[in-house]
């Protein structure tokens, strides 16, 4: 397993509709054809997997049907979007990138993006 640098923004504020987007960029040392991206959430010293997708370079990311994540890739950048967020989902979202094929296997873990989700004021039809 070889180390790889992964960059992501430090802070993102979710929209009033509970949507947060951020870019996860990795420094690919070679020409990977198969990449796996995992989003982890760290809160209260617990780390849980939010979503994961494997994609072939040049193709769309494919998350599971019931995933709360969507994403697109462009070169060594992955644009990730998480939906359905509310205040209790505030936390540090860590981007983990694995270059699966061809060998050698590379692993990179970002420092995390702190996503803040705010409960809107109680007004008609606001998003919570």
């Amino acid at each position: 397993c070889k180390a790889m640098h992964v960059a992501q923004p430090a802070v993102v504020l979710a929209s009033s509709r509970g949507i947060a987007s951020f870019v996860c960029e990795y420094a690919s040392p070679g020409k990977a054809t198969e990449v796996r991206v995992t989003v982890l959430r760290q809160a209260d010293s617990q780390v849980t997997e939010v979503c994961a997708a494997t994609y072939m370079m040049g193709n769309e990311l494919t998350f599971l049907d019931d995933s709360i994540c969507t994403g697109t890739s462009s070169g060594n950048q992955v644009n990730l979007t998480i939906q359905g967020l509310r205040a209790m989902d505030t936390g540090l979202y860590i981007c983990k990138v694995e270059l699966m094929y061809p060998p050698p296997y590379y692993l990179g873990i970002g420092n995390g993006t702190q996503i803040y989700v705010i409960d809107p004021e109680p007004c008609p039809d606001s998003d919570f």
Epitope: D66, I68, L85, R86, M88, D119, P122, D125, F128
Partner: antibody, heavy 123, light 107 residues
């Protein structure tokens, strides 16, 4: 095991107020949102509002704005729903239901409901 | 205001039939939709969340699909205990509106 236990049935006169309680047990109270949903006799489900027990933040359905108040007491793991200026059409069974944050592992929304509290408004 | 419209409002089917209930939403909600079953005199029970995730303990004859504004609940082989009213609901964002319900009866 997870339980949401609601207060007993109430009979109220038009114009009066009612306060229904929902006591949670078997899970971390402040880690889940709580909703209130009502169902008039023979009718469908109607969402009333949501409260975040950890912050006290609330959001109410437009229909109930100004007439409903939802609060939580973390010391007793209880949420309350108060409805004032009662009218006959408020006669219904009132339910509380818990709702985890979307990022909670194996968390499903509205997975546990209280047993329901019948509120009858009659002169 | 967001609206959820279920169809049909009621339906009658035979044991073993494949039954489909649809829920149309007035705006795009991605996949953030629940399905419930409520038997007469009982509290609602969660069947499907996030459009297609089967809730723990729910029989595999229930399945959900759809995204955006059009969603479907399917019962692959109707059982006598499925006599109930079924509701869809928008979740994870207020207002958490319910559909008007679909009453399912056995022929």
């Amino acid at each position: 095991q997870v339980q949401l236990v609601q207060s007993g049935a109430e009979v109220k006169k038009p114009g009066a107020s009612v306060k229904v309680s929902c006591k949670a047990s078997g899970y971390t109270f402040t880690s889940y949102y709580m909703h209130w949903v009502r169902q008039a006799p023979g009718q469908g489900l109607e969402w009333m509002g949501i409260v975040n027990p950890s912050s006290g933040s609330t959001n109410y359905a437009q229909k109930f704005q100004g007439r409903v108040t939802m609060t939580s007491d973390t010391s007793t793991s209880t949420v309350y729903m108060g409805l004032n200026s009662l009218r006959s059409e408020d006669t219904a069974v009132y339910y509380c239901a818990r709702d985890p944050p979307i990022t909670m592992v194996r968390g499903a929304p509205f997975d546990y409901w209280g047993q329901g509290t019948l509120v009858t408004v009659s002169s | 205001d967001i609206q959820l419209t279920q169809s049909p409002s009621s339906l009658s089917a035979s044991v073993g039939d494949r039954v489909t209930i649809t829920c149309r939403v007035s705006q795009d909600i991605s996949r953030l939709l629940n399905w419930y079953r409520q038997k007469p005199g009982e509290i609602p029970k969660l069947l499907i969340y996030r459009a297609s995730s089967l809730q723990s303990g729910v029989p595999s004859r229930f399945s959900g699909s759809g995204s955006g504004t059009d969603f479907t609940l399917t019962i692959s082989s109707l059982q006598p205990e499925d006599i109930a009213t079924y509701y869809c609901q928008r979740t994870y964002s207020a207002p958490y509106t319910f559909g008007q319900g679909t009453k399912l009866e056995i022929k």
